[in-house]
Interface confidence: low
């Protein structure tokens, strides 16, 4: 399986909400011994490998934000902890999963990584990640709504996140 990031760059004004999205592609084993963890964390663009460094998002670790289920099942994070930090991660039946960040501040700018870990009991984990940049802007040059830039082309698309 692979992870696709529909948008590689999100440019948002301070105070806005944004939903960062990843999509799980390819055949997904729904066997009883297969577990999927989907999660999010902050990182930096390392020399060797993007997303190799794991940093918390608003003090929540990748474990606080993880979704745990089999196959393409829907799931949500522990609401209380995440929502206290203005965060919510979610997953649907079609392989889409996302993290929503509310009331953005300049400190939220940076590289975000989504991670899918396939665990087969008695076997090693297989992990695939996707990366995207979030730029939070303030002042007169900031957009009125989030502007997202697709990963596959340079065209931008205005959305209200």
């Amino acid at each position: 399986f692979k992870v696709a990031t529909p948008y590689s760059l999100y440019v948002c004004p301070e105070g806005q909400n944004v939903t960062l999205t990843c999509r799980l592609l390819g055949p997904v084993d729904k066997g009883h011994d297969v577990t999927f963890y989907k999660t999010w964390y902050r990182s930096s663009r390392g020399e060797v490998q993007t997303c190799s460094e794991r940093r918390p998002i608003r003090n929540l670790t990748f474990q606080d934000l993880h979704l745990h289920h089999g196959g393409h099942q829907a799931a949500n994070t522990s609401h209380d902890l995440a929502q206290r930090h203005g965060l919510e991660s979610a997953s649907d039946h079609h392989g889409n999963f996302s993290i929503t960040m509310r009331n953005l501040t300049l400190l939220d700018s940076g590289l975000y990584c989504c991670l899918v870990v396939e665990i087969r009991h008695h076997h090693s984990e297989h992990r695939v990640h996707g990366a995207m940049e979030l730029q939070v802007q303030t002042g007169k040059d900031a957009p009125s709504n989030c502007v997202v830039y697709p990963s596959s082309s340079q065209d931008s698309e205005n959305i209200t996140a």
């Epitope: 794991r54 990748f62 665990i119 008695h122 090693s124 984990e125 992990r127």
Partner: antibody, heavy 121, light 108 residues
Framework: QVQLVESGGGVVQPGRSLRLSCAAS????????MHWVRQAPGKGLEWVAI????????YYADSVKGRFTISRDNSKNTLYLQMNSLRAEDTAVYYC??????????????WGQGTLVTVSS | EIVLTQSPATLSLSPGERATLSCRAS???????LAWYQQKPGQAPRLLIY???NRATGIPARFSGSGSGTDFTLTISSLEPEDFATYYC?????????FGQGTKLEIK
């Protein structure tokens, strides 16, 4: 920086028990699976056991299954190996090693310096 | 259980020479879940290569890994004096994890 410090080794008689500890520092212990790996004098490396980050799953080498128990206390950043019914062939340096895996298991990216266990009458 | 066989058992070379170490698995190691470690006498092993071909943090570029399936190779392009040690391959494809018996790289 990441540090793993093993303790609890020593000389023990066959059939007796011993508990090894591994104190971890310099990283978020509760985010990583952990392993014990051993090396008999002059021999190669042998994987012993793994425990997942939250203790939910444990797996053992056949040679120690039913005799050794791996456990962890995330509040104390400590990994344990309870060794019962010890045999002469358990004599080895025991290393604790951090797994690079996010949840379950992957390769070992950091190792302790080891503690020697000698089983002898 | 996946059995890993390393060859040669001992390799005698001089500094500046190229070293090629082999690791063969008894069954296919999917996703190239194979690592290489270096161990010097009295020391703990050190991770060199993971996922068959990725250098670990801080490992010099003279170390490289290759291979897939059942045949894997560790290459040291130009030996430095500090490279003389014992090298182990390890699979993390399935439990029980297994190591090769090691290749001792000694100074000729």
């Amino acid at each position: 920086q990441v540090q793993l410090v093993e303790s609890g080794g020593g000389v023990v008689q066959p059939g007796r028990s011993l508990r090894l500890s591994c104190a971890a520092s310099g990283f978020t212990f509760s985010s990583y699976a952990m392993h014990w790996v051993r090396q008999a004098p002059g021999k190669g490396l042998e994987w012993v056991a793994i425990i997942w980050y939250d203790g939910s799953n444990k797996y053992y080498a056949d040679s120690v299954k039913g005799r050794f128990t791996i456990s962890r206390d995330n509040s104390k950043n400590t990994l344990y190996l309870q060794m019962n019914s010890l045999r002469a062939e358990d004599t080895a340096v025991y290393y604790c090693a951090r797994d690079s895996g996010f949840y379950s298991s992957y390769y070992f990216d950091y190792w302790g310096q080891g503690t020697l266990v000698t089983v002898s009458s | 259980e996946i059995v890993l066989t390393q060859s040669p058992a001992t390799l005698s070379l001089s500094p500046g020479e190229r070293a090629t170490l082999s690791c063969r698995a008894s069954q296919s190691v999917s996703s190239s879940y194979l690592a290489w470690y270096q161990q010097k006498p009295g020391q703990a092993p050190r991770l060199l290569i993971y996922d068959a071909s990725n250098r670990a943090t801080g490992i010099p570029a003279r170390f490289s890994g290759s291979g897939s399936g059942t045949d894997f190779t560790l290459t040291i392009s130009s030996l430095e004096p500090e490279d003389f040690a014992t090298y182990y391959c390890q699979q993390y494809n399935s439990y029980p994890y297994t190591f090769g018996q090691g290749t001792k790289l000694e100074i000729k």
